[in-house]
């Protein structure tokens, strides 16, 4: 029986050009974490494997940094980074736990008014 729960950083609004940390924490289980995948909209961003360490997908290498811990740092944010991010914990013997975080990237100083995304 899966007893664990995932706690996340919570949804985030961030400014274009900035950086944010996405973090998840698995609690209430003694299961062993074998791997954590970070994904966005069916795209794999990064993997942290208990034995092999971190692997960042080549297309995100410039803007994604591992950590802190099992979290992920996104840098040089663009409006196209707006979307839902998933932390997927592979554990033994429980199986898979998934956390969800929505990131909204705003144009600078428009959280209060104005359009959020500008098409170039």
């Amino acid at each position: 029986m899966m007893t664990g729960t995932i706690e996340t950083t919570g949804n985030i609004s961030a400014e274009k050009g900035g950086s944010i940390i996405l973090q998840c924490h698995l609690s209430s289980t003694t299961a062993q974490v074998t791997q954590v995948n970070w994904e966005q909209q069916d795209q794999l961003l990064a993997i942290c494997n208990a034995d092999l360490g971190w692997h960042i997908s080549p297309s995100f290498k410039d803007r994604v940094a591992p950590g802190p811990g099992l979290g992920l740092t996104l840098q040089s944010l663009t409006v196209n980074d707006t979307g839902e991010y998933f932390c997927i914990y592979h554990t033994y013997p429980d199986g898979t736990y998934t956390g969800r975080i929505f990131l909204e990237v705003l144009e600078s100083s428009v959280a209060e008014h104005g359009a959020r995304f500008q098409i170039p």
Epitope: N11, I21, E84, R100, F117
Partner: antibody
């Protein structure tokens, strides 16, 4: 003036599908997230999901995965929600609502869906 | 999913009254950056819901200053200082901090 104009009431048979539209005006359509909300029994509000007109990205409430499909047509500044395999439980008022920083600042007038044989 | 519990379910009032509506969350609504995405809405019969307050205490444009929001963590309150006829309807809180967003069950503000 920001306006979200939704399509009219629908009466459909169980098992059928329906497409509800939400035409936006008075602002940059691609600049804001569009949310969809279900109101059952004239009271309970449930978030169905959202779509990001800028890049087509979606996020769904797990409860509505497979039931609702969200799309947009940027050229007409219109958001759509397809509701599939309808049952009487889907009878409700459905709203589109513009989102910014996890608040819904403008809402459509609502579309009443009645599923009945 | 995060559960928002609103109290009271029904609030009979007289015009001119001051009232408070409570919204309690099953977990903290503060994200790791200190933002709390808790908003309040009024749904009048035959109309669309309208945004009153966002991020706990910020009044949306055009909302009268008799509406105010407060709270932190898991406990939030909407206060209406002097009830007017146009304030009658259903009030809902909404949390946007955790996926999926969830609404409170609503509080009906009605005349005594």
């Amino acid at each position: 003036e920001v306006q979200l104009q939704q399509s009219g009431p629908e009466l459909v048979k169980p098992g059928a599908s329906v497409k509800i539209s939400c035409k936006a005006s008075g602002y940059s359509f691609t600049g804001y997230i569009m949310n969809w909300v279900k109101q059952s029994h004239g009271k309970n509000l449930e978030w169905i999901g959202l779509i990001i007109p800028y890049n087509g990205g979606t996020s769904y409430n797990q409860k509505f995965r497979g039931k609702a499909t969200l799309t947009v047509d940027k050229s007409s500044s219109t958001a759509y929600m397809d509701l599939l395999s309808l049952t009487s439980d889907d009878s409700a008022v459905y709203y589109c609502a513009r989102g910014l920083s996890y608040r819904y600042d403008y809402w459509g007038q609502g579309t009443t869906l009645t599923v009945s044989s | 999913d995060v559960v928002l519990t609103q109290t009271p379910l029904s609030l009979p009032v007289s015009f001119g009254d001051q009232v408070s509506i409570s919204c309690r969350s099953s977990q903290s609504l503060a994200n790791s950056y200190g933002n709390t995405y808790l908003s309040w809405y009024l749904h009048k019969p035959g109309q669309s819901p309208q945004l009153l307050i966002y991020e706990i205490s910020n009044r949306f444009s055009g909302v009268p200053d008799r509406f105010s929001g407060s709270g932190s963590g898991t406990d939030f309150t909407l206060k209406i200082s002097t009830i007017k006829p146009e304030d009658l309807g259903m009030y809902y809180c909404l949390q946007g901090t955790h996926q999926p967003p969830t609404f409170g069950g609503g509080t009906k503000l009605e005349i005594k």
